[in-house]
């Protein structure tokens, strides 16, 4: 014997109180598959969550985060506050990255500057709270004849002879 409820399409539920008639989902509820005996309550996007897609009788609402926050988790199950570049979110709110660390995004944690010397390279551009250091050629590469590419000569103040 076929279950009469299997004929109920998405957007309806099989109403046991009415001889298993297919009844439309009540307001603020949905069923995304056929044959359901109940409709699910629609997700509500409240507070820092805002509605990206309205709930319909056949699909749940979808939320994203209000400006100043970003989604975390599957289906944007959490909203986390943004910080500025050069900061990270701590238990005391957004805090500047400590010296020697950087964050080039509005989310995530401060990460240590690259240690150029581990790769045998020199620091070409110093790091900041917002940017990693830029590693340059290794000191060996800077010795005469080591490379066909000549690095730019450092600028000198007038009247100063090279060391």
């Amino acid at each position: 014997l076929q279950d009469p409820c299997s004929n109920c399409p998405a957007g309806t539920f099989c109403d046991n109180n009415r001889n298993q008639i297919c009844s439309p989902c009540p307001p603020n509820s949905f069923s995304s598959a056929g044959g359901q005996r109940t409709c699910d309550i629609c997700r509500q996007c409240k507070g820092v969550f805002r509605t990206r897609k309205e709930c319909s009788s056949t699909s749940n609402a979808e939320c994203d985060c209000t400006p100043g926050f970003h989604c975390l988790g599957a289906g944007c199950s959490m909203c986390e506050q943004d910080c500025k570049q050069g900061q990270e979110l701590t238990k005391k709110g957004c805090k500047d990255c400590c010296f020697g660390t950087f964050n080039d995004q509005k989310r995530g944690i401060c990460r240590p500057w690259t240690n150029c010397s581990l790769d045998g390279k020199s620091v070409l551009v110093n790091g900041t709270k917002e940017r990693d250091v830029v590693c340059g050629p290794s000191p060996a590469d800077l010795s005469p004849g080591a490379s066909s590419v000549t690095p730019p000569a450092p600028a000198r103040e007038p009247g100063h002879s090279p060391q």
Epitope: G47, F49, C63, S77, M78, C79, Q81, L89, K92, C94
Partner: nanobody, 122 residues
């Protein structure tokens, strides 16, 4: 049904004080962490303060020393005492549950009040 109702907002002069209240019903308040957030006109939402069920508190840097969050479990109410108010504190203040226990992070299952407007102006 869960309900969070904020009150206590209004117009206050710079340097003045206000106490916001958030009356909670429909869930076990005493074991729930609570938070306040705000949204200034034309600005983004901002986490302001949070309080654990134990009473431990956290504040955004800009309000530290001026705002005090507290709770009365007997009255199912969380408060935000605001003093030395500045024009930049003008915002709608929202009370919310705080299930993540992570500063500046809210879960989809958190409950929110409708907000109360605080205007700081001379």
């Amino acid at each position: 049904e869960v309900d969070l109702v904020e009150s206590g907002g209004g117009l206050v002069q710079p340097g003045g004080s206000l106490r916001l209240s958030c009356a909670v019903s429909g869930f076990t308040f005493s074991s729930s962490a609570m938070s306040w957030a705000r949204q200034a006109p034309g600005k983004e939402f901002e986490w302001v303060s949070s309080i654990y069920s134990s009473g431990k508190t956290y504040y955004v840097e800009s309000v530290k020393g001026r705002f005090t969050i507290s709770r009365d479990n007997a009255k199912n109410t969380v408060y935000l005492q605001m003093s030395s108010l500045r024009p930049e504190d003008t915002a709608v203040y929202y009370c919310a549950t705080w299930k993540t226990l992570r500063v500046g992070v809210w879960d989809e299952s958190d409950y929110w009040g409708q907000g109360t407007l605080v205007t700081v102006s001379s």
